[in-house]
């Protein structure tokens, strides 16, 4: 999936299986990613688990779990708030669109989470205070929390190089992260589809093009569009909303 | 073991985090260090066998000597609101205000800095 980190780095990751997205003293978010096509390096999120840890007089521990074709509007125990404590309403789930869009507000830690199902896969977005982001007990184990540190270098896909290949007259072959590029989406069509929803040619737009070229699944256009929309709602600095290609970054510049 | 509470109170009191204090801030920094030391001493009985406690004690000793702080002298109150430790070390609070981050934060400092993370597509 494509990842926008807390530090506004943008990456495309091929991380497969379960990975920690956020892990601090208050919250744990884990995603499970699966290949979008058999044999493909490109993966998308098929499962999401969020654990809100027990906190003071506010909330009991609550677990939220979403999977492909199952986006619940309640925690795993059936509740929609933080439990029986005085401040239980400082944690709330709101269903925005049944089966497609859920918002979780954790006021006690100043955090808002948006989970969507777009097509077959899930998207995730969060707004969180820096103080909460950095509230980590075991500093030495911070290495692989994707939102904080980004993806390991060996798990990143260079989609800018992929795009350069795609733009050239010959179809990308070995350079492609997908062994079979769907012929149904010529580069020009992918560009047109993405332009419709994402007029600014930023990295969300580039991600959209990449996704259409690798999968042929038009739902990924919506995934990029909603990711940008959620960013508009959740990002505190509107000037930083659109991220653009940087000139080649040194490897490891993410952390 | 409430050592994490001591840690977060110290970092919030010094607010510049890991940066060394400017020379005119040293007395205030030393006062915050003495408060930190007192806080860790108060947790000693229930934290003495844990790594976090020993790290804090050694860290305090190092900072005290680096900044030539005397062991005796004034202590300070934390300047900004800190999140109490979560999970293992629950702090009891009868005030529902603690359950509203922004209300609780604004009492003590400027608006918090927010960050955003997103994951989507393939």
């Amino acid at each position: 999936p494509h990842l926008r980190t807390f530090t506004d780095h943008f990456q495309t990751c091929k991380v497969q299986g379960a990975w920690p997205l956020i892990d601090n003293n208050y919250l744990n978010v884990q995603v499970t990613n699966t290949p979008v096509l058999p044999g493909s390096a490109a993966t998308a999120t098929s499962k999401l688990t969020i654990i809100f840890k027990n906190f003071q007089e506010c909330v009991d521990q609550k677990v939220y779990q979403a999977e492909m074709d199952e986006l619940p509007s309640a925690f795993a125990d059936g509740s929609k708030n933080g439990g029986d404590k005085h401040g239980a309403n400082s944690l709330k789930i709101t269903e925005k669109v049944s089966g497609q869009h859920v918002e979780i507000q954790a006021k006690y830690i100043g955090t808002t989470i948006v989970v969507r199902q777009v097509g077959r896969y899930l998207t995730f977005a969060v707004r969180m205070p820096e103080e909460v982001v950095n509230a980590v007990e075991d500093r030495d184990s911070q290495g692989l929390y994707l939102c904080l540190r980004g993806c390991p270098l060996n798990q990143q896909i260079d989609f800018q190089a992929f795009r350069a290949n795609a733009e050239s007259p010959r179809r990308p072959a070995a350079a492609s992260p997908s062994p079979v590029v769907p012929e149904t989406f010529p580069y020009e069509t992918a560009v047109a589809k993405c332009k419709e929803k994402l007029p600014v040619e930023d990295l969300y737009y580039q991600a959209c093009v990449f996704d259409l070229l690798t999968t042929g699944d038009v739902n990924f256009t919506l995934a990029a569009y909603y990711a940008l929309e959620d960013g508009k709602m959740l990002h505190s600095n509107k000037d930083k909303l659109h991220l653009f290609e940087r000139t080649r970054e040194l490897p490891g510049a993410v952390a | 073991c409430k050592i994490l509470k001591c840690n977060s109170e110290f970092w919030s009191a010094t607010s510049s985090g890991s940066h060394a204090p400017a020379s005119d801030d040293v007395p205030e920094f030393c006062a915050a260090l003495r408060t930190y030391a007192l806080c860790t001493r108060r947790t000693a009985r229930t934290c003495r066998g844990d790594l976090a406690y020993h790290s804090a004690v050694h860290g305090i000793e190092d900072l005290m000597s680096q900044h030539n702080c005397s062991k005796d002298g004034p202590t300070s109150q934390p300047r900004v609101r800190t999140l109490p430790p979560a999970g293992d070390s629950q702090e009891r609070s009868d005030s529902p205000e603690i359950c509203h981050y922004e209300k609780s934060f604004h009492k003590h400092s400027a608006a918090p800095n927010y960050t955003h993370c997103g994951l989507f597509g393939d």
């Epitope: - | 409430k2 947790t43 229930t46």
Partner: antibody
Framework: EVQLVESGGGLVQPGGSLRLSCAAS????????MNWIRQAPGKGLEWIGM????????HYADSVKGRFTISRDNSKNTLYLQMNSLRAEDTAVYYC????????WGQGTMVTVSS | DVVLTQSPLSLPVTLGQPASISCRSS???????????LEWFQQRPGQSPRLLIY???SRFSGVPDRFSGSGSGTDFTLKISRVEAEDVGVYYC?????????FGQGTKLEIK
């Protein structure tokens, strides 16, 4: 989720020895002090001793001093209790517990000292 | 050694009613830096002990707010505001201020 699993209990004759193990998971074992506590059948709880995160210090109850030794292997996430010169009054369920003062406990292992 | 004396040793309570357990220490549990280290544990029948309250009044993670602790010096109390069926078991106080660490003898709470 914090999990502590004790093992090594059983029947032993007075004067004999036994080594109990406690396998820890769900937390960073090497960061925490650990305790052993026991409970004789139908009786209350008795603290046996504790060990610091790095084994630098150990503290024992008077009733076991000189006979019991607590150790740990952080690379294996395991806590040990070596019990020598066992007596009938050492018959109990033995629990390991996380933290300098115990918060999470294991399910216990039964030690019976009898001839 | 510090001796902790609990009372009553047996406590029959009606469901929904409050309950109170006392723990008295043979010496003050306040240390020289002002900390008081008294904990309360619950042991349900056939189960391991579970931490309820630490540092006199701080409720541990996941403990319902009907449990509360109070006290200072040598006198401490555990209160259950409304007893529920799952509260049946033995309750122990425990001090960590002085070595060796010691437990009270336990109070058995049962439903009338």
């Amino acid at each position: 989720e914090v999990q502590l699993v004790e093992s090594g209990g059983g029947l032993v004759q007075p004067g004999g020895s036994l080594r109990l193990s406690c396998a820890a998971s769900g937390f960073t074992f090497s960061y925490y002090g650990m305790n052993w506590i026991r409970q004789a059948p139908g009786k209350g709880l008795e603290w046996i001793g504790m060990i610091y995160y790095d084994s630098s210090e150990k503290h024992y109850a008077d009733s076991v001093k000189g006979r019991f030794t607590i150790s740990r292997d952080n690379s294996k996430n395991t806590l040990y209790l070596q019990m020598n010169s066992l007596r009938a009054e050492d018959t109990a369920v033995y629990y390991c517990a996380k933290g300098t003062t115990p918060d999470y406990w294991g399910q216990g292992t039964m030690v019976t000292v009898s001839s | 050694d510090v001796v902790l004396t609990q009372s009553p040793l047996s406590l029959p309570v009606t469901l929904g009613q409050p309950a109170s357990i006392s723990c008295r220490s043979s010496q003050s549990l306040e240390d020289s830096d002002g900390g008081t280290f008294l904990e309360w544990f619950q042991q349900r029948p056939g189960q391991s002990p579970r931490l309820l309250i630490y540092d006199v009044s701080s409720r541990f993670s996941g403990v319902p707010d009907r449990f509360s602790g109070s006290g200072s010096g040598t006198d401490f109390t555990l209160k259950i505001s409304r007893v529920e069926a799952e509260d049946v078991g033995v309750y122990y106080c425990f001090q960590a201020t002085h070595d060796p660490l010691t437990f009270g003898q336990g109070t058995k709470l049962e439903i009338k």
